[in-house]
């Protein structure tokens, strides 16, 4: 059984950096394994080597550790439009990203989806598309921003936020998201 994280941290703090307490003998500090390897056997005693083995294909460790198993490599999620930027190595997980002219939208800390950058048709680019943020568009007069596209004011219903933006006016307005459409 793996001890709770707090217990492991407590045990590690007794040893100098780069070492950990032997699980069966708390007077012995063993050297941690380098990244790209995992703990096969604890060191037999003080000053003796920890038995570390290289991670097998499809697994990795990205930092020094005393893990009994390497971590499984992540797979890029094709259904989310993700592409592989760099493949998994023994000391680095797979890096996933998006294609050119796309941005990442994080639904949660560990899940992102790739979407096409908005082109700002019927408007101008206020802020360019970035890795983790869509283009920010400013709509021309007579248009309002809905789902990050500039839509004609003829499509504005009285019940929607766009009524403020679609009042007769001469100067350009910076579109604000129409909150009544999702």
């Amino acid at each position: 059984l793996v001890p709770p994280l707090r217990d492991r941290e407590k045990r590690d703090s007794v040893c100098p950096q780069g070492k950990y307490i032997h699980p069966q003998n708390n007077s012995v500090c063993c050297t941690k394994c380098h990244k790209g390897t995992y703990l096969y056997n604890d060191c037999p005693g003080p000053g003796q080597d920890t038995d570390c083995r290289e991670c097998e294909s499809g697994s990795f460790t990205a930092s020094e550790n005393h893990l009994r198993h390497c971590l499984s490599c992540s797979k890029c999620r094709k259904e989310m439009g993700q592409v592989e930027i760099s493949s998994c190595t023994v000391d680095r997980d797979t890096v996933c990203g998006c294609r050119k002219n796309q941005y990442r939208y994080y639904w949660s800390e560990n899940l992102f989806q790739c979407f096409n950058c908005s082109l700002c048709l019927n408007g101008t680019v206020h802020l360019s598309c970035q890795e983790k943020q869509n283009t920010v568009c400013t709509c021309h007069a007579g248009f309002f921003l809905r789902e990050n596209e500039c839509v004609s004011c003829s499509n504005c219903k009285k019940t929607l936020e766009c009524t403020k933006l679609c009042l007769p006016q001469t100067e350009n307005v910076k579109g604000t998201e129409d909150s009544g459409t999702t």
Partner: nanobody
């Protein structure tokens, strides 16, 4: 016209189980990635799980991993969410939805089914 209709919610005690269903129509169900999201009282939408059409692993949020199982029956155009070891924090309205395509919003989702976990 796309229609998604959830069912199976209800009141359950902590540690209990529920199975949610989502009947889909108006599109080619077998070709679409399907999603379960939830909204707890006073909170925003949380992505729970999704399942691609075929051949790829489902995704689970860390908060439900090991407890919830998503599945689909393409012959019945139905999406499922098996929820075990339920906790008070799982209390929410659960919605099924089609994976968004145009941008980070849901064009198509159901009316939701309420799951209440309480003793």
């Amino acid at each position: 016209e796309v229609q998604l209709l959830e069912s199976g919610g209800g009141l359950v005690q902590p540690g209990g189980s529920l199975r949610l269903s989502c009947a889909a129509s108006g599109f080619t169900f077998a070709h679409e990635t399907m999603v379960w999201v939830r909204q707890a009282p006073g909170k925003g939408l949380e992505w729970v799980s999704h399942i691609p059409p075929v051949g790829q692993d489902p995704f689970y949020a860390d908060s439900v991993k090991g407890r919830f199982t998503i599945s689909r029956d393409n012959s019945k155009n139905t999406l499922y969410l098996q929820m075990n070891s339920l906790r008070a924090e799982d209390t929410a309205v659960y919605y099924c939805a089609l994976l968004p395509k145009r941008g980070p919003w849901f064009d198509y989702w159901g009316q939701g089914t309420l799951v209440t976990v309480s003793s």
